[in-house]
Amino acid sequence: SASSRRRQQSRNRSTQSQDVSRGSGSSDYNGSELKTACKKHELYVSFQDLGWQDWIIAPKGYAANYCDGECSFPLNAHMNATNHAIVQTLVHLMNPEYVPKPCCAPTKLNAISVLYFDDNSNVILKKYRNMVVRACGCH
Amino acid sequence: SASSRRRQQSRNRSTQSQDVSRGSGSSDYNGSELKTACKKHELYVSFQDLGWQDWIIAPKGYAANYCDGECSFPLNAHMNATNHAIVQTLVHLMNPEYVPKPCCAPTKLNAISVLYFDDNSNVILKKYRNMVVRACGCH
C-alpha cells in the first residue's frame, strides 16, 4: 500500500544507505560551488616537510591520504554512513544553521613502522597506529 | 640537548595530543569569528519532525546529539585525535588550500531500541546501532 511504501522509504532513510537520486549537494560555505561526495584522496606526507627529518630515519615519508567531500542527503552506500549520520543529514536539511552535515572522516586506518632516534640517540623501530587512511565515510 | 628536546616536541606532535597553548583557532569561514573546539553538542530529535511518526510507535524522539567544532593545531587531549589527524593538522597548516583540517566526528556511538510498524503492520521492537553520539573527536 502507499502507506507501507511511505513507511519503507522513511525506514530506509534511517537504517540503510539510500540510492543517490541527485548530486552531492551544494557546499554550505561557497555559494553554488559543488563539492564532490565524501571519498579518500591520495596524499603523500614527507617527514622533511613536517620538520621531522632530524629524528625519523626511515621512511622519508608515507602515503597518509585524507578524507574530504560532501555528506549530503541522500547518503549513498559508498559513504559508509552510520545511522546517526543519516539522522543528522535529515536534521541538517531542516535546520542547516543549527546542525552541520555529518563530516567525511576515516573509517579504516592502518599503521606504519617508523625507525627513529629516541632522546638518548638510540635507534628504535616502532609501529604507529592509525597513520594511513584506507577508507572514508560520513560520520 | 636542544636537538633531543626538538625531537621530543616533534615526536609528541605526531604521536600524542598536545597541551593547548591558545584558543581553539579561528573559523575557516568567517574572518575573526572564533569557533569552539570540537565537542559534543546536545540535540533532541523528534521523529515527527523527520516525518517518521507514521511508522515509529516509540519513542517519540531521542537525544541523538552531534559533533561540531574546530580541529585546529594544536590538538589537545580532549579531542581524541588519531595519529593521522595530528599529521593532517600539520599538513593543513602548511597547505591549507589542498588539505582540509581533520573533522569533528563521533568517536563513541550508542544504540537505541525502537518500536515500529513493519510493512505488514506488525509491531516490531528493534535495536538500532550507532544512533546516539556519546563522544566526539578529531578524525
Epitope: M94, N95, P96, E97, Y98 | Y29, N30, E33
Partner: antibody, heavy 118, light 108 residues
Amino acid sequence: EVQLVESGGGLVQPGGSLRLSCAASGFTFSSYAMSWVRQAPGKGLEWVSAISGSGGRTYYTDSVKGRFTMSRDNSKNTLYLQMNSLRAEDTAVYYCAKRPYNSPFDPWGQGTLVTVSS
Amino acid sequence: EIVLTQSPGTLSLSPGEGATLSCRASQSVSSSYLAWYQQKPGQAPRLLIYGASSRATGIPDRFSGSGSGTDFTLTISRLEPEDFVVYYCQHFGGTPFTFGGGTKVEIK
C-alpha cells in the same frame, strides 16, 4: 523583550556597496540562527541569507551568492549584511529575523530601505 | 526548491465573514515546517501560525491553520477590521526558506 533594529540602508548606485546592521537585544544572541529577508516595493517576501549562531555556517539565496556576505559579531550582539555589486533588483526593505531551532522567523526587525538607482 | 503558491491573490470580504486562504506546495512538505505570517502596511511581518496549525503567542483564536502534504489553509473565522491586510505562508524546513506570493484580504 526581544528587539531587532536594522540600520545602514540608503540610496546607492548600481555596482555600489552597502553594509546593513541589525542590533539585537533581549535574548542570548549567540544561541540563535539569524536571517535576512527582503521585500521589494509592492512585492512579496524573499529570504536572502541565514547564519548559524557561531557564525561558522552561512547560506544564501541564489540571486545574491558571491555578492552578499552575511556575518555576525556575537560580542556586540550585531548581525551584518555586506552587499556588493548592487543591482536595481536589490532595491527592497531588508528585515533581519531570529530563527529558533525548528521554528519560523520570529520576531522581525522594523526593516531598513535599500534603494539602488543611478 | 519548494515553491509555494497562494490563492487567491486577493480576497474581497466583509467584516464578520470568514476567510479561507490557500497555500499549495510544489512538493510534499512536513506540516511541522509550514508557517503563516500577517503583514500590515508599513510594518514587518508577524508570525501567526507555525507547524501548520499551532497559533503563535498572542494570536487570537479566530486564526487557525490546517493541512498536510501539499495543501495548507489559513482560516479566519470572523474578520475584524484589522485583519484586512496581507498574509504569507512560508516553508522553513531548510534553505532556501521560501514564501508564498501572498494573499491580500480586502474589504468588499
